[in-house]
Amino acid sequence: CDLPQTHSLSNRRTLMIMAQMGRISPFSCLKDRHDFGFPQEEFDGNQFQKAQAISVLHEMIQQTFNLFSTKDSSATWDETLLDKFYTELYQQLNDLEACMMQEVGVEDTPLMNVDSILTVRKYFQRITLYLTEKKYSPCAWEVVRAEIMRSFSLSANLQERLRRKE
């Protein structure tokens, strides 16, 4: 399965929506900056089978959706932009799920790189804990928005490779 061109477009739209979501100047939140340890090695894609890469991308997008669909998130971000954001994320999840089915068939569960899935989950755990420690402050959300934008940009490289890979 090759990811459709629309998937790359959706990823770009997601980045644009996240950029529009910014409400406060990042400069006013410099003191809240945090290194969440984005697991770059999981998105390099060299050591991956295609099915594993798709699983890792799916986990990242699903966790992003969950992160931004909490009550605390709804109270922070513009509702119209959030709805657009959800739509794009769902589009990407659907693309990846369609690919998964084609890669291995509906009934078959391939050997996933479970440690990669766990590594992505832990990355989002660090983000979640940061938000709870900061009591979901506007600056904390701004830092997280910037981090997720960065992670989507970095994962876009893997998505692009998947789109071209036979």
Partner: antibody, heavy 119, light 108 residues
Framework: QVQLVQSGAEVKKPGASVKVSCKAS????????MHWVRQAPGQGLEWMGE????????IYAQKFQGRVTMTRDTSTSTVYMELSSLRSEDTAVYYC????????????WGQGTLVTVSS | EIVLTQSPATLSLSPGERATLSCSAG???????LYWYQQKPGQAPRLLIY???NLASGIPARFSGSGSGTDFTLTISSLEPEDFAVYYC?????????FGQGTKLEIK
Amino acid sequence: QVQLVQSGAEVKKPGASVKVSCKASGYTFTNYWMHWVRQAPGQGLEWMGEINPSHGRTIYAQKFQGRVTMTRDTSTSTVYMELSSLRSEDTAVYYCARGGLGPAWFAYWGQGTLVTVSS
Amino acid sequence: EIVLTQSPATLSLSPGERATLSCSAGSSVDSSYLYWYQQKPGQAPRLLIYSTSNLASGIPARFSGSGSGTDFTLTISSLEPEDFAVYYCHQWSSYPFTFGQGTKLEIK
């Protein structure tokens, strides 16, 4: 509010299979991994594995690999855990628990399903 | 597999006393992935503490957690009658996820 409702108690003979269901409500079913944890009478908790209802992929504990099958039905927001080749040591209460992150990790549990394996 | 060993197996105390429950990991566990659960007879476990020291929603402030590496502690500052139950530590730092064997807190 989040609710996980499990199927009723089962009595099975050694060598048979059992299929326990867990129906979820109060949240977007496909967004969270669902886990299965069991507890033998008077014993501690034991993690069996998890399923992502969105795409159906599973991760099983090595101990249960080959004997456990976790599936889901997105149309009814239900996950299933089937355990085959039952033996007396499989007599336990089986729980489903919803994944999540931070304060949401295993914050929601089903009420439990007692599976008794006896000849 | 990370083995979690809880001690003591049973702790007999009176209401108003302080309870200290230990959880020792066979190998290092990142504190972000160490959780505590309470279970009463006939009930499902209930989340008490997440990420070593954070109180779950609705849990009274008399409960607290601490620790790092391989040694973790759950403390109940002043026992209430409803606190007598079994307590489990749990890790999801690596597969397979594991639980301690439990500490039964009983009324003296």
